[in-house]
């Protein structure tokens, strides 16, 4: 590997470096989709950009592999607990490989939001934020879930969102 | 671009990514004004540092364009949850540039503390923490609110803070 | 310092950067010690691995000095809130140096799950995230500690968890 | 400066209601709580409960929960305070107090004149 | 209820003198290092007045000869040196729970 490779080479880091992985993707309208699969994510409008990741129904798919540090927010609200729907919230980030049929589990929290009315207001808000570094290979995909997800509240792209960078 | 050209700027490159901008703000008596305005910072003391990023007034004012993981953590606490405070509080970063008269929200929490207080104790604790990915240009600003303040605990430094890397 | 030490220092510095230090542990069986001690990881299966800093005794130890954003997460879960457990639970991240004989608090919360609990329902779940970025010195160590750690519950790695990374 | 006017002193019969109203000045009347406490000759302050302008939410003493009505009318920055089935041992001095935090501890940093209630047959 | 405890019921000091006076809470009225405990001044025919809050906290407009003191369950109202109108009725009040409860008062007459 002679000066003029490893030179091209620092060049290729140079401009690789510029364009280090990230993500994040904002809370639509569209998110929820009561169909059990993922929460669906705004890309482009607003704050949300994909940086040398791509998305595809719900996932973020990894182009460069490595170490990322993937996240999620999610805001949780209502008016008590309605019955039939879960007291426990589950909020998790998942990984898709073509090496696996099924999803594997990255990062959950468990929840219980409803306890967080008082006896004044039925009311109640919560949050729930997940984050942490995984290995994911170029092809992989992370997908973002809630149950029960009717619990989970969307406006305007800041109170539930999904992203990630390479570290 | 000829390679003395390159080869500063692969110098200028290395020295400017030793200094990949970076802060850590920590929470300070000073922080809570009751003004209406944002939370206030130490920036210097204890475990504070600013890297590459400066500060003004509570902002954390952006010298390099790019992408930032931008954080904030705050450390809620009351007895009972007294009539006139909010019983929802809203905790926020907030973008402020130029281009626009108002700030901008980035990454919002609405919580329900109070639920927390239980029969046999009316003291509660809550943990608010947001983290995520945005596009800064240089001069933007970036700010914590919390609304209502009066339920933000202050004491070390350990337990509201705000800070901001670049990815 | 001629061209020669300075293509030296470049190609160092691009192996370094391939392995810019990055961990991720996760919560197992043997995590609780009990002993008042700090919470015990996985390093190696599943999700959990180190790269460019090692681990002892439930400590990430730093092998390169510089800022790190350091994170942890645990899930905490119980019946009702029995009498003798703190109906407060601290979470918090400390720092372990040779210069001083005691731990030092980098970033801590408080919460007051049992709260959550609700009229029908006497389980309660509740997570506590911590984030932020700290100047760590080589040989330095950080921890985490939770107090009561009876409330934190284990599964699968997933839920409980404590990672680094350089920025 | 932030000023409380309550009403004039009433007698009333046992029995009967009796509302006092206090009319807020000089301050954002949405922003603070109203609370009331009373005085009985020669004896000591007991707390009445309190009322927050911005919503019209309430917080009362047990002990008058159920007599005591707690009420604020925004369009006049004006509180009040009713008592119902009143008996001779409600004769006092009726105070309104603006409320403040610090923090999430409450403390009572503006007094109106009082109000003195008389029940008497 | 929490039961606010006030020492002595009389007090008898000379001008220029300093007065300690005491309150005692039932059980605690802290949190996070602050405690949820107020003092009041009342002359005859007046409303009580503000002087310190959250135990040491002074009122704005107070004079700094007034000061607050203790924690947890115990608590002090000093007076550094009398003046003739400091002669009134004190005080304290606990805001740590429902209901705010206030101590029987301490009058302070002139020796």
């Known amino acids: 590997d002679g000066p003029a490779g490893s030179w091209e080479q620092l060049i290729q880091e140079r401009r690789s470096h510029e364009v280090n992985p990230a993500a994040h993707l904002t809370g639509a309208n569209s998110s929820l989709t009561g169909s059990g699969g993922p929460l669906l994510w705004e890309t482009q409008l607003g704050l949300a950009f994909l940086r040398g990741l791509s998305y595809h129904d719900g996932a973020l798919v990894v182009t460069k592999a490595g170490y990322y540090y993937i996240y999620s927010k999610v805001q949780l609200g209502g008016v008590g607990c309605p019955l039939g729907l879960a007291s426990t919230i589950t909020h998790g980030l998942y990984k898709r490989t073509p090496r696996y049929p099924e999803e594997l589990e990255l990062l959950v929290s468990q929840q219980s939001p409803c306890g967080r009315a008082t006896s004044s207001s039925r009311v109640w808000w919560d949050s729930s934020f997940l984050g942490g570094v995984v290995h994911l290979e170029a092809g992989e995909e992370v997908v973002v879930r809630v149950l029960d997800e009717r619990l989970v509240r969307l406006r305007d792209g800041t109170r539930s969102y999904f992203g990630a960078f390479m570290v | 671009d000829g390679p003395a050209g390159s080869w500063e700027q692969l110098i200028q490159e290395r020295r400017s990514h030793e200094v990949n901008p970076a802060a850590h703000l920590t929470g300070a008596n000073s922080s809570l004004t009751g003004s209406g305005g944002p939370l206030l910072w130490e920036t210097q003391l204890g475990l504070a540092f600013l890297r590459g990023l400066s500060y003004h007034d509570g902002a954390l004012v952006v010298t390099k364009a790019g992408y930032y993981y931008i954080y904030s953590k705050v450390q809620l606490g009351g007895v009972g949850c007294p009539l006139g405070l909010a019983s929802t509080i809203t905790h926020g970063l907030y973008k402020r540039t130029p281009r626009y008269p108002e700030e901008l929200e980035l990454l919002v929490s609405q919580q329900s503390p109070c639920g927390r207080a239980t029969s046999s104790s009316r003291v509660w604790w809550d943990s608010s923490f947001l983290g995520g990915v945005v596009h800064l240009e240089a001069g933007e600003e970036v700010v914590v609110r919390v609304l209502d303040e009066r339920l933000v605990r202050l004491r070390d430094g350990t337990r509201s803070y705000f800070g901001a890397f670049m990815v | 310092d001629g061209p020669a030490g300075s293509w030296e220092q470049l190609i160092q510095e691009r192996r370094s950067h391939e392995v810019n230090p990055a961990a991720h542990l996760t919560g197992a069986n043997s995590s609780l010690t009990g002993s008042g001690g700090p919470l015990l990881w996985e390093t190696q299966l599943g999700l959990a691995f180190l790269r460019g800093l090692s681990y002892h005794d439930g400590a990430l130890v730093v092998t390169k000095a510089g800022y790190y954003y350091i994170y942890s997460k645990v899930q905490l879960g119980g019946v009702g809130c029995p009498l003798g457990l703190a109906s407060t639970i601290t979470h918090g991240l400390y720092k372990r140096t040779p210069r001083y004989p005691e731990e030092l608090e980098l970033l801590v919360s408080q919460q007051s799950p049992c709260g959550r609990a609700t009229s029908s329902s006497r389980v309660w779940w509740d997570s506590s995230f911590l984030g932020g970025v700290v100047h760590l010195e080589a040989g330095e160590e950080v921890v985490v500690r939770v107090l009561d750690e009876r409330l934190v519950r284990l599964r699968d790695g997933t839920r409980s968890y404590f990672g680094a990374f350089m920025v | 400066q932030v000023q409380l006017v309550q009403s004039g002193a009433e007698v009333k019969k046992p029995g009967a209601s009796v509302k006092v109203s206090c009319k807020a000045s000089?301050?954002?009347?949405?922003?603070?709580?109203v609370h009331w406490v009373r005085q009985a000759p020669g004896q000591g302050l007991e707390w009445i409960g309190a009322v927050y302008p911005g919503n019209g939410d309430t917080s009362y003493n047990q002990k008058f929960k159920g007599r005591a009505t707690l009420t604020a009318d925004k369009s006049t920055s004006t509180a009040y305070m009713e008592l119902s089935s009143l008996r001779s041992e409600d004769t006092a001095v009726y105070y309104c107090?603006?409320?403040?935090?610090?923090?999430?501890?409450?403390?009572?940093?503006?007094w109106g004149q009082g109000t003195l209630v008389t029940v008497s047959s | 209820e929490i039961v606010m405890t006030q020492s002595p019921a009389t007090l008898s000091v000379s001008p220029g003198e300093r007065a300690t006076l005491s309150c005692k809470a039932s059980q605690s009225v802290d949190f996070d290092g602050d405690s949820y405990m107020n003092w009041y001044q009342q002359k005859p025919g007046q409303a009580p007045r503000l002087l310190i809050y959250t135990a040491s906290n002074l009122e704005s407009g107070i004079p700094a000869r007034f000061s607050g003191s203790g924690s947890g369950t115990e608590f002090t109202l000093t007076i550094s040196s009398l003046q003739s109108e400091d002669f009134a009725v004190y005080y304290c009040q606990q805001s740590y729970e429902d209901p705010f409860t206030f101590g029987q008062g301490t009058k302070l007459e002139i020796k």
């Open positions: 107090a603006r409320g403040s935090y610090y923090y999430t501890s409450s403390y009572f940093d503006h």
């Open positions: 000089g301050y954002t009347f949405t922003s603070y709580n």
